[in-house]
């Protein structure tokens, strides 16, 4: 005999499990229909009824096939350093990364909790190691024929010019100065600028903390307690 | 395969309290309640009520309320009956059962009460 | 709550013989097309082991000398021809609705 597609509720042959989109219903004790992302349980299933669903309401959403009694609450508006990165809809949290100059110092399943401006290095030091989405600047002072004289999160220590006659010699925060005959070879004039970091999806990463840096200032965002996670077996 | 193993014999003195366990295996814990069935010597089976083990929500039947307790550890996938204020009438062999209309059943435990 | 009576309490059948075991429930047992009234058997000292489930449905590895069958409130266990290990008591059990309900059981001898 061909087998016989069952209709939700139907209760589950011995040892099996129910198909994909069905939740097994511990009080009804049957396979049940999934509500689809978007929409939440309004009635849970009996042995002669199957789910019912309804759509989340707004500021709320379900990202999952789900049998939640109530969808899950979109997270609070993006903060000042942050850019809202995915919109909250009935199907999708809204997502708040770090806008640019700012890295996550703590981030969250999705998007980041609190973000902190990048380090900048004063003169002196320049960048070792750029930020990213997820880590801070790492500073370090200019090794002997390099300076840096700016307060920046992107520039490095760059080569002292060559002078055929030095006027002023250079040090770890300023550059040689030459006497009015031309130098030898010298630097491109201008900053040299390490690309910023594009703040997408962030994990955590503690900031390396640097003791030649100029201080860095947190804001703390508010913090929630992270939504229930949808799925598994229910009532 | 689905398997339930529940602890071994008791004998308790009226007063006391016991806690039965019953540990599944072969299959999702989380996914199916949990029933406790009572069969005192030489009767039939008494169905005492459930937990469900998603949500932790237990279900008494009538009689059952009070002194009965189920409870779960869901990181070892085990299931618990705690008897307390025990009378030589709560002398049974005590049953864990899968909530799957049809039952899948544990090896029973004897709780035996005298004093 | 649903309130099912076994009969007869006991029978004793001679080898090879039919034996049938009624159960009757106080109101349906009936949803969704199904009948949720399964069949168990116990043997002293081990726990019910499934036969039948949904009024009519062998379990996996129980012998197909056993079967159920009926409908709403009125349900039989056939052992069509009786074997020495089948002495047991026979019990159905409703779980159309809380709380799940036994039948007082049935005791099957050898004649």
């Known amino acids: 005999l061909p087998a016989q597609v069952a209709f939700t509720p139907y209760a589950p042959e011995p040892g099996s499990t129910c198909r994909l989109r069905e939740y097994y219903d511990q009080t009804a004790q049957m396979c049940c229909s999934k509500c689809s992302p978007g929409q939440h349980a309004k009635v849970f299933c009996t042995k002669t009824s199957d789910t019912v669903c309804d759509s989340c309401e707004d500021s709320t959403y379900t990202q999952l096939w789900n049998w939640v009694p109530e969808c899950l609450s979109c997270g609070s508006r993006c903060s000042s350093d942050q850019v809202e990165t995915q919109a909250c809809t009935r199907e999708q949290n809204r997502i708040c990364t770090c806008r640019p100059g700012w890295y996550c110092a703590l981030s969250k399943q999705e998007g980041c909790r609190l973000c902190a401006p990048l380090r900048k290095c004063r003169p002196g030091f320049g960048v070792a190691r750029p930020g990213t989405e997820t880590s801070d600047v790492v500073c370090k002072p200019c090794a002997p024929g390099t300076f840096s004289n700016t307060t920046s999160s992107t520039d490095i220590c760059r080569p002292h010019q060559i002078c055929n006659v030095v006027a002023i010699p250079g040090n770890a925060s300023m550059d040689a100065v030459c006497t009015s005959t031309s130098p030898t070879r010298s630097m491109a004039p201008g900053a040299v600028h390490l690309p910023q970091p594009v703040s997408t999806r962030s994990q955590h990463t503690q900031p390396t903390p640097e003791p030649s840096t100029a201080p860095s200032t947190s804001f703390l965002l508010p913090m929630g307690p992270s939504p229930p996670a949808e799925g598994s077996t229910g009532d | 395969q689905v398997q339930l193993v529940q602890s071994g014999s008791e004998l308790k003195k009226p007063g006391a309290s016991v806690k039965v366990s019953c540990k599944a295996s072969?299959?999702?814990?989380?996914?199916?309640?949990m029933s406790w069935v009572r069969q005192a010597p030489g009767q039939g089976l008494e169905w005492m009520g459930w937990?469900?083990?998603?949500?932790?929500?237990?279900h008494y039947a009538q009689g059952f309320t009070g002194r009965f307790v189920f409870s779960l550890d869901t990181s070892v996938s085990t299931a618990y009956l705690q008897i307390s204020s025990l009378k030589a009438e709560d002398t049974a062999v005590y049953f864990c059962?899968?909530?799957?209309?049809?039952?899948?059943w544990g090896q029973g435990t004897l709780v035996t009460v005298s004093s | 709550d649903i309130v099912l009576t076994q009969s007869p309490d006991s029978l004793a059948v001679s080898l090879g013989e039919r034996a049938t075991i009624n159960c009757r429930a106080s109101q349906t047992v009936d949803s969704s097309g199904n009948s949720f009234m399964h069949w168990y058997q116990q043997k002293p000292g081990q726990p019910p082991k499934l036969l039948i489930y949904?009024?009519?449905r062998l379990e996996s590895g129980v012998p197909d000398r056993f079967s159920g069958s009926g409908s709403r409130t009125d349900f039989t266990l056939t052992i069509s021809s009786l074997q020495a290990e089948d002495v047991a008591v026979y019990y159905c059990q409703q779980s159309n609705e809380d709380p799940w309900t036994f039948g007082g059981g049935t005791k099957v001898e050898i004649k």
């Open positions: 072969g299959y999702t814990f989380t996914t199916f309640g």
């Open positions: 059962a899968r909530r799957s209309n049809f039952a899948y």
């Open positions: 937990i469900n083990t998603y949500s932790g929500v237990p």
């Open positions: 949904l009024g009519n």
